[in-house]
């Protein structure tokens, strides 16, 4: 699910942008897999990568830069 | 169910320091944010600071930063916070409160029964 | 520092009454909106979280709305146990902070 797509129903928050990271409905939504952008306390939690909030769970996730891994891609991927 | 305790109320000098604790049962400890929220007689809300699980330190609110220390001792499952140089304005009631997350500081979803700190001369 | 601005900062209402709490923020933050309710010499205690949400135990009656800057805390049907302050909090970013309260009394 690292990758992201553009909606352009998503009240300004599309995926890609610096500052928004990955589109939310404007409506609650429950399913696995919404995003939202991360709160901006977490502007540091991804060392390498991008940071998008799972809205169900309400927990920041990352997305790596390529040849990076581990939750916070605080690692470089050896296999790259 | 998760509980906190806190000390019991406190009257100090101005100038002097005081440390407050909050005791932490029924959860996992070291898993949580605690910040430290204090209330003035007939005010509102104020956040001070709070440890933040992902960063592993604290992060205080400007106007407190340097009077302020917030610390958790994970074998006692008790977080602290110490204000010192106290004057009058100080005089409050203190709240602990856990985050829902336990990433960073999102809901204060418990909270302890608060600890009033009265500063006078 | 995000501020937070409620609206009004008291009212008086009936029990059955319909009403409504605004919040707003000084700057866009997305959901990151909590409600709480305090009684006099009591903790507060967490009722809506992220904009919209229900906190485990806390009544139906009770709803939040609202995203970016603007919020909204609604009691359907005001009960007598619901005459208390409410405060808003953000936690967009650092400081966390809240609204200055709206005091809900009985007419």
């Known amino acids: 699910d690292g990758n992201s797509t553009r909606s352009p129903e998503t009240n300004g928050l599309l995926c890609g942008d610096p500052e928004e990271n990955c589109a939310a409905t404007t409506t609650q939504s429950k399913r696995k897999g919404h995003f939202s952008r991360c709160p901006k306390q977490y502007k540091h939690y991804c060392i390498k990568g991008r940071c998008r909030f799972v809205v169900a769970e309400q927990t920041p996730s990352c997305v790596c830069d390529e040849g990076y891994i581990g939750a916070r891609c605080e690692r470089v991927d050896l296999f790259y | 169910q998760v509980q906190l305790v806190q000390s019991g109320a406190e009257v100090k000098k101005p100038g002097s320091s005081v440390k407050v604790s909050c005791k932490a049962s029924g959860g996992t400890f070291s898993s949580y944010a605690i910040s430290w929220v204090r209330q003035a007689p007939g005010q509102g809300l104020e956040w001070m600071g709070g440890?933040?699980?992902?960063?592993?330190?604290?992060v205080y609110a400007q106007k407190f930063q340097g009077r302020v220390t917030i610390t958790a001792d994970e074998s006692t499952s008790t977080a602290y916070m110490e204000l010192s140089s106290l004057r009058s304005e100080d005089t409050a009631v203190y709240y602990c409160?856990?985050?829902?997350?336990?990433?960073?500081?999102?809901?204060?979803?418990?909270w302890g029964q608060g600890t009033l700190v009265t500063v006078s001369s | 520092d995000i501020q937070m601005t409620q609206s009004p900062s008291s009212l008086s209402a009936s029990v059955g009454d319909r009403v409504t709490i605004t919040c707003r923020a000084s700057q866009s933050i997305s959901n990151f909106l909590n409600w709480y309710q305090q009684k006099p010499g009591k903790a507060p205690k967490l009722l809506i979280y992220a904009a919209s949400n229900l906190q485990s135990g806390v009544p139906s009656r009770f709803s939040g709305s609202g995203s970016g800057t603007d919020f909204t805390l609604t009691i359907s049907s005001l009960q007598p146990e619901d005459f208390a302050t409410y405060y808003c909090?953000?936690?967009?970013?650092?400081?966390?902070?809240f609204g200055q309260g709206t005091k809900v009394e009985i007419k």
């Open positions: 409160a856990r985050s829902s997350s336990t990433y960073g500081i999102h809901a204060f979803d418990y």
């Open positions: 909090q953000q936690y967009d970013d650092f400081p966390m902070t």
């Open positions: 440890i933040v699980p992902w960063m592993g330190e604290a």
